[in-house]
């Protein structure tokens, strides 16, 4: 493994940096003077960006809003004024930009209408923001217009009525395929799941709702589940919580045939003031926060077998607030496996866990090298790295940005943090780690806005400060040296960067103001990085390594989930491009099978530092409750399952004799008979 | 009672370094934190920094962050705080301050402060060429 | 890091009579805030934290109240005792940081 950012490298500068990187930026002034400016890409690698920028001014009886909208083709270099596309509309920033999915160029705007209006109207586009469509809405629309994933011209929306309207030819014309809906979302297939209110609205059925399925675009409707709260979409899995017969609890069942069949997670019950949520969910299996009985804002993290029905306790004390809904569970892109989220100790104070092999075992986050812990440390040499994310960010701790990984700069993960015992409420620092969260090392002093550029060939920051700034720091070793570029005389109110989604571009925005006494004026610099980069990388430049490599020893080294990755990484010395069409190079090896690669099935348990599953001692000899496709099941087992995405072969296969547990269902939720089909008529 | 009591005055020559001592007792020395604060003459207090006498973990104020090191003897509840590379406007009295709250962040629960609640009497650090 | 900004800088005050003391946060600092009186030729003493809870042996006469960025330190009756600075300081984000003072004067 590479080791971690060296702090007391001996920086070279690069040559000429300063004249390379002066011809690549370009200033736009955007000549109005809007309160809030909202930004847009259109497509995957078109250069495409749109610019929303908004100016309200709230009167006695009416607001008096005006927006005007900006089209760069260049990434952002150039910007056009395209108000006059949009008949210079104000447009309502809640409903935001809806972008089509993929490279389908579609975008849809919602316009503010006046008040006596009879429905909504949208501006539409289907070649990437050259022309507009005005197209008058037969309803007010609630939430923004989603696109099906599979079809960009279908499109579902809410009204503020609560009807569900479907639209099959990119919003030019409307239909309501049913009322009283309280939440619509895709599934696969143009698939369109919903649930509707029986008797008086969506806040009073809550847990009284129908479940609904229609996957002909409206013409026909199977209702899928009553008694239902809520429900969600995950990976393969549908999820519905679903209130008990005999008190006010509901329970997770799901179902992995978009509601044909219907099984009871094993998962505990919730009251009426907690809830369910799915963390992170993929083709394999799902992680679950139950949240814990009392205003306590935690929880339970548990993770899910191939089924999405048998689960395994993966972490307690998970904090989760129940009031902001803020949790800092974050999937790390750059390496397969790897989670980190924040537990609430018992002195209420937070500590950060990282997982490497999907929720199996958390641990602390190991502590940078040459760092000093501080003062939440009971032991001065010993502490750990403490990761601050969505909580620090809505608590205000100074903190701008939440951790970033990027799938395609493999083992790269940036993310403000605090060494000692515990998150403290002292000026953060960032923090790099170049193998998945293994290790770290300290990137910058105090807290910054960062971004990663050509997959990883460069990593660009701006200091986070109240006062104007105008220099950018970057650094094409993986964060170990930077160098400071000033790219404009006169600095500016930072409000963000921007680089086009996938971080493989070279290009990065910087978005501000400047401030006069009565104007403030919005302005972007945008700085190409590809004089910086202006080799392609070649083969000699990449080198090989082994993820999740611990103890390079043993033969099992680098085995996650019954099989190790080796991949080619760029060399930190190496100052070349790894390009637009840069695909990360792996090599896939499956690992042998041991007992750390099986999870124990229903009825099961593993004893805190055992191996082995053993049957639950409450268990034995008695009738579970248990339902299996909504109907009293017969379940054999031997205790073991591998675990969802395992991969191993050979080596040890938990064999023992194959129990036949008798299950009684005790879930009415749905019985075949229950479910019926309708047409719309 | 509890009680901090601090080191007498100090005069020193710009660059030297000064090293305050502040004397805990009258409770567990180990169970608080311990906050440094100074007042240049005429001035309001600035907030330099806080030591874990548990385990003798620190957080600098980023301003002091490299001239100023904070320590403690667990054997004679002391701690000691060193600043160097004096200059003349580190002229001040620098007060200990017994500091409960610390510094972790806190849950949904909130993060409750109760303030400095027992103070040293004070060291008279002079810089002067 | 948090600017905390006290007004008035001085406040002529006659015994007996109430004082009213402002402290203003450059944001949020929630109720981390505690208010200290300084005499010459004295420690800082702690009068009130948590924003609005009096400290052991302060007489009732002093009171806190505020949350998030605007707090008030109050004297209903003003003791000859009480003619001091008074200073608040935030422990919400690091580093700590004080107002700049209230002198209260004897009028």
């Known amino acids: 493994r590479r080791g971690a950012p060296a702090e007391d490298q001996d920086c070279g500068r690069l040559p000429d940096f300063i004249a390379k990187l002066t011809n690549n930026t370009h200033q736009h002034v955007f000549d109005d003077l809007s309160g809030s400016v909202s930004l847009s890409w259109v497509g995957d690698s078109t250069g495409v960006i749109l610019v929303l920028t908004t100016f309200q001014v709230p009167l006695v009886i009416v607001s008096f809003g005006q927006s005007k909208l900006y089209r760069s083709e260049d990434y952002g270099k150039n910007f056009k004024d395209i108000t006059n596309l949009i008949n210079n509309t104000f447009i309502r920033t809640e409903f935001g930009m809806a972008i089509g999915p993929e490279n389908s160029g579609k975008v849809i705007l919602t316009a503010e209408v006046s008040g006596g209006s009879r429905g909504g109207r949208v501006f539409r586009s289907s070649d990437f923001a050259k022309n507009f469509v005005q197209t008058d809405l037969p309803f007010h629309p609630l939430t923004q217009m989603m696109y099906s994933p599979q079809n960009s011209d279908y499109l579902l929306a809410l009204s503020t009525e609560n009807g569900l309207w479907v639209s099959k030819n990119f919003g030019e014309k409307w239909e309501e395929i049913h009322k009283a809906v309280c939440l619509a979302k895709w599934g696969p297939n143009n698939i369109i799941f919903f649930t509707t209110h029986v008797n008086g609205s969506c806040k009073a059925d809550l847990g009284a709702l129908e479940l609904w399925r229609t996957s002909d675009l409206g013409k026909t409707f199977k209702t899928i589940g009553v008694k239902i709260y809520s429900f969600g979409l995950g990976g393969r899995f549908l999820f519905a919580s679903v209130m008990a017969d005999k008190d006010t609890t509901r329970r997770i069942h799901v179902s992995t045939d978009q509601g044909d069949t219907w099984s009871m997670a094993q998962l505990p019950s919730v009251g009426q003031e907690q809830f369910y949520s799915i963390l992170a969910a993929n083709e394999d299996m799902v992680f679950m926060h139950v949240d814990e009985p009392g205003d306590t804002g935690f929880g339970t993290i548990f993770t899910s077998d191939d089924r999405g029905i048998v689960y395994s306790k993966s972490l307690d004390r998970h904090l989760y607030t129940t009031t902001g809904g803020e949790t800092d569970f974050t999937n790390v892109t750059s390496l397969r496996g790897v989670y980190i989220t924040s537990t609430l100790s018992e002195d209420n104070s937070i500590q950060s866990m990282i997982t490497f092999d999907q929720g199996g075992r958390w641990e602390h986050l190991r502590k940078p090298e040459n760092s000093k812990c501080d003062a939440t440390a009971k032991n001065k040499n010993e502490c750990s790295l403490h990761i601050h994310a969505s909580y620090s960010i809505s608590q205000k701790l100074n903190v701008p940005m939440a951790p970033l990984s990027e799938p395609n700069a493999v083992g790269i993960v940036i993310a403000h943090g605090s060494v000692g015992d515990a998150i403290s409420v002292m000026v953060p620092d960032v923090y790099i780690s170049d193998d998945g969260g293994y290790s770290w090392a300290k990137m910058l002093e105090g807290p910054h806005y960062y971004t990663i550029l050509d997959s990883g060939g460069i990593i660009v920051a701006i200091e986070h400060s109240n006062r104007p700034i105008n220099v950018i720091k970057f650094s094409t070793d993986e964060g170990q040296c930077w160098q400071s570029y000033v790219f404009t005389q006169e600095p500016i109110y930072f409000t963000g960067l921007a680089s086009e989604p996938g971080a493989r571009s070279m290009n990065i925005s910087i978005w501000g103001f400047t401030e006069s006494f009565i104007t403030r004026q919005w302005v972007s610099y945008t700085v190409d990085f590809k004089d910086i980069l202006e080799r392609n990388c070649e083969e000699d430049d990449y080198t090989t390594w082994l993820a999740h490599s611990t103890d390079p020893g043993d033969y099992k080294d680098g085995c996650i989930l019954g099989y190790k990755e080796q991949f080619l990484r760029l060399r930190k010395s190496s100052v070349c491009q790894n390009g637009r069409d840069y695909v990360v190079a792996k090599q896939p090896s499956v690992c042998p099978c041991s007992l750390e690669d099986f999870l124990c099935d229903f009825g099961y348990f593993r004893p805190e530092n055992a191996s082995e599953c053993v049957e639950q001692p409450e268990l034995k000899g008695h009738e579970l409750e248990f339902c299996l496709y909504g109907k009293e099941e017969h379940l054999t087992t031997n205790g073991y399952r591998k675990i969802p995405g395992d991969k191993c072969q050979g080596g040890m296969n938990p064999a023992r004799e194959v129990k036949d547990l008798k299950k009684k269902c005790t879930s009415n939720f749905l019985n075949p008979t229950k479910q019926n089909s309708k047409s719309n008529s | 009672q509890v009680q901090l009591v601090q080191s007498g005055a100090e005069v020193k020559k710009p660059g030297a370094s000064v090293k305050v001592s502040c004397k805990a007792s009258?409770?567990?020395?180990?169970?608080?934190?311990m906050s440094w604060v100074r007042q240049a003459p005429g001035q309001g207090l600035e907030w330099m920094g806080i030591i874990n006498p548990y385990g003798g973990s620190t957080s600098y104020a980023q301003k002091f962050q490299g001239r100023v090191t904070m320590t403690r003897d667990t054997s004679t509840s002391t701690v000691y705080m060193e600043l160097s590379s004096l200059r003349s406007e580190d002229t001040a009295v620098y007060y200990c301050?017994?500091?409960?709250?610390?510094?972790?962040?806190?849950?949904?629960?909130?993060?409750?402060?109760?303030?400095?609640?027992?103070w040293g009497q004070g060291t008279t650090v002079t810089v002067s060429s | 890091e948090i600017v905390m900004t006290q007004s008035p800088a001085t406040l002529s005050v006659s015994p007996g009579e109430r004082a009213t003391l402002s402290c203003r946060a450059s944001q949020s600092v929630s109720s981390n805030l505690a208010w200290y009186q300084q005499k010459p030729g004295q420690a800082p003493r702690l009068l009130i934290y948590g924003a609005s809870t009096r400290a052991t042996g302060i007489p009732a006469r002093f009171s806190g109240s505020g949350s998030g960025t605007e707090f008030t330190l109050t004297i209903s009756s003003l003791q000859s005792e009480d003619f001091a600075v008074y200073y608040c300081?935030?422990?919400?984000?690091?580093?700590?940081?004080f107002g700049g003072g209230t002198k209260v004067e004897i009028k």
């Open positions: 301050a017994r500091d409960p709250s610390g510094i972790a962040a806190a849950g949904p629960a909130s993060r409750y402060y109760y303030g400095m609640d027992v």
């Open positions: 300081q935030q422990a919400r984000l690091g580093p700590w940081t």
């Open positions: 009258g409770y567990t020395f180990t169970s608080t934190y």
